[in-house]
């Protein structure tokens, strides 16, 4: 099966926890850590938000 794009942390996302626990065997979760699913969602909606704001400018 192909890996879902939000299942794996991207380097530019900073503190990140893979949403597939098998991809995080060390257990790096902290209070500051967001799952890759959340970060992927945030990244896409922020891009959309930036696009709207740029369009208004």
């Amino acid at each position: 099966l192909p890996t879902l794009p939000w299942s794996v942390c991207q380097e530019e996302w900073g503190d990140c926890l893979p949403s597939d626990p098998d991809l995080d065997p060390v257990g790096t979760i902290t209070n500051e850590t967001k799952s890759s699913a959340e970060l992927y969602f945030l990244k896409t909606v922020l891009q959309q938000k930036d696009g709207i704001e740029d369009g208004l400018g």
């Epitope: 967001k34 959340e38 969602f41 945030l42 896409t44 909606v45 922020l46 959309q48 938000k49």
Partner: nanobody
Framework: QVQLQESGGGVVQTGGSLTLSCKAS???????MAWFRQAPGMEREFVAG????????HYLDSVKGRFTISRDNTKNTLSLQMNSLRPGDTAVYYC???????????WGQGTQVTVSS
């Protein structure tokens, strides 16, 4: 400022269904929104998110195909239809609205979902 109020939680048996609702105190059509959950002793985790217009939907891998997020911008409500519930879904479920680079700004008080085996 936006107040968010969740409802629809309860106790359900494994395999059962629940629908959670989140009512906002004012218009939320300009905001992305999401559902999070927190089980006892665990961190709060992202469950599902939805973009401003109902597009751009993402789910936690373990709920994909079982949970459905939706919104009604005319009623300022966010919903989470939860099917095929499992004991591992037991948690307090929170809705959240409006995104910045650090995460969500507005949070509800949460509603308890308990899935018994």
């Amino acid at each position: 400022q936006v107040q968010l109020q969740e409802s629809g939680g309860g106790v359900v048996q494994t395999g059962g269904s629940l629908t959670l609702s989140c009512k906002a105190s004012r218009r939320t059509s300009g905001f992305a929104m999401a559902w999070f959950r927190q089980a006892p002793g665990m961190e709060r985790e992202f469950v599902a998110g939805i973009g401003r217009t109902g597009d751009n939907i993402h789910y936690l891998d373990s709920v994909k195909g079982r949970f459905t997020i939706s919104r009604d911008n005319t009623k300022n409500t966010l919903s989470l239809q939860m099917n095929s519930l499992r004991p591992g879904d037991t948690a307090v479920y929170y809705c959240a609205a409006d995104v910045t680079k650090s995460g969500f700004i507005y949070w509800g008080q949460g509603t308890q979902v308990t899935v018994s085996s």
